[in-house]
Amino acid sequence: MSMTDVLSAEDIKKAIGAFAAADSFDHKKFFQMVGLKKKNPDEVKKVFHILDKDKSGFIEEDELGSILKGFSSDARDLSAKETKTLLAAGDKDGDGKIGVEEFSTLVAES
C-alpha cells in the first residue's frame, strides 16, 4: 500500500510544496491540501498505517518528524518545533505518541 493508492499524486505534490519552507508546517492546512480531510475513515486509517513505519500501532515522535516523507520521499523533515506542535495537537491521551483514533480525530478537526 502506497500513499498514492489513497491520495492523488498531484495533491501530494502541491501540499508538500506549500510547506517547503522551514517552520511553515500547519497540519490543518496540510491535511486539507493533501486531500485527507475529505477521505472516509477507512482511508484515513490506511494513511495512518503507512505513516506508522515500524507497525507499532502508533506514530511516535521520530516518525512524526518525518511525516512529510511518508507522503513524498523527497520532502523535508519537520523541525523539532514543528514536530512538538504536531505531537501536542494529536496526542490526546498524553502518552507521547499518536494512535490511529487520535490521528483520525486530528484529521477530522482540520
Epitope: K53, D54, K55, S56, G57, F58, E60, D62, G65, D93, D95, G99, V100
Partner: antibody
Framework: EVNLVESGGGLVQPGGSLRLSCATS????????MSWVRQPPGKALEWLGF??????????EYSASVKGRFTFSRDNSQSILYLQMNTLRTEDSATYYC????????WGQGTSVTVSS | DIQMTQSPSSLSASLGERVSLTCRAS??????LNWLQQEPDGTIKRLIY???ILDSGVPKRFSGSRSGSDYSLTISSLESEDFVDYYC?????????FGGGTKLEIK
C-alpha cells in the same frame, strides 16, 4: 519481504561468552528499534531489552536480569543486530529471538543457547 | 515494572468454538498491547497490535479488545491450526513485559 535470521547459538560453559547475530532484510533497519527476547525451555517469553533507532541515537535499554552482562549493538551498514553475552549462567539457557519494531511486529526463528558444564 | 497476568494458562476447546484469552495490566498501558502466537517449532508471529489492530495476513476470526485494564484476544471459531501457544506483550513502558502464556489445546 521482511526477514530476520538469528545465528551463533550453541553450547557454552558457565562463565563463558557467546555472541549472537541477527541478520535482517526487507525493512528500513535504521528506523527500527531492535529487541532481544528469550525463552527458557518450557517457560514464557522474556524481554531482554532493545537498541533504539537512528532518531534516538541507537541508545540501549536492558532488563534487570541481563544488565551489565549482555550488550546489544548493531551494524547499520549491514542491517545486522548483535547480542554479546558474557559471564553466562545456567539460567541463561534458552532460545534467543531478535525482534524488530517498537511493537515487535517482526521476529526471527530463534537460536538455541545452552549453558552447561 | 508492569506485570501482565494472563489467563487462563491452558484452555481446552473444540473446533469451531469461540474462545477468549485475557491479560490484565498492573498499571496503565493505554493501547500498547500485542498478542503473539507461538507454534510448537518455536515460530512466533504477531496477531494483534495496539490492542485491536489485526496484523497483515492474520485471519479475521482473531480480534482484540480492551475493557479497563483487561485486554482480550478472541478467536471467533477455532480452526485446527489455532491450537498453539499465545502471549500478550505490553510495550507502553520499559521493561516491556509478557504475559505467562496460554496453551490452547484441542478437546
Amino acid at each position: 519481504e521482511v526477514n530476520l535470521v538469528e545465528s551463533g547459538g550453541g553450547l557454552v560453559q558457565p562463565g563463558g561468552s557467546l555472541r549472537l547475530s541477527c541478520a535482517t532484510s526487507g525493512f528500513p533497519f535504521t528506523d527500527f528499534y531492535m529487541s532481544w527476547v528469550r525463552q527458557p525451555p518450557g517457560k514464557a517469553l522474556e524481554w531482554l531489552g532493545f537498541i533504539r533507532n537512528r532518531a534516538h541515537g541507537y541508545t540501549t535499554e536492558y532488563s534487570a536480569s541481563v544488565k551489565g552482562r549482555f550488550t546489544f549493538s548493531r551494524d547499520n551498514s549491514q542491517s545486522i543486530l548483535y547480542l554479546q553475552m558474557n559471564t553466562l549462567r545456567t539460567e541463561d539457557s534458552a532460545t534467543y529471538y531478535c525482534g524488530g519494531g517498537r511493537g515487535l511486529g517482526y521476529w526471527g526463528q530463534g537460536t538455541s543457547v545452552t549453558v552447561s558444564s | 515494572d508492569i506485570q501482565m497476568t494472563q489467563s487462563p494458562s491452558s484452555l481446552s476447546a473444540s473446533l469451531g468454538e469461540r474462545v477468549s484469552l485475557t491479560c490484565r495490566a498492573s498499571q496503565d498501558i493505554g493501547s500498547s498491547l500485542n498478542w503473539l502466537q507461538q507454534e510448537p517449532d518455536g515460530t512466533i508471529k504477531r496477531l494483534i497490535y495496539a490492542t485491536s489492530i489485526l496484523d497483515s495476513g492474520v485471519p479475521k476470526r482473531f480480534s482484540g479488545s480492551r475493557s479497563g485494564s483487561d485486554y482480550s484476544l478472541t478467536i471467533s471459531s477455532l480452526e485446527s491450526e489455532d491450537f498453539v501457544d499465545y502471549y500478550c506483550l505490553q510495550y507502553a513502558s520499559s521493561p516491556w513485559t509478557f504475559g505467562g502464556g496460554t496453551k490452547l489445546e484441542i478437546k
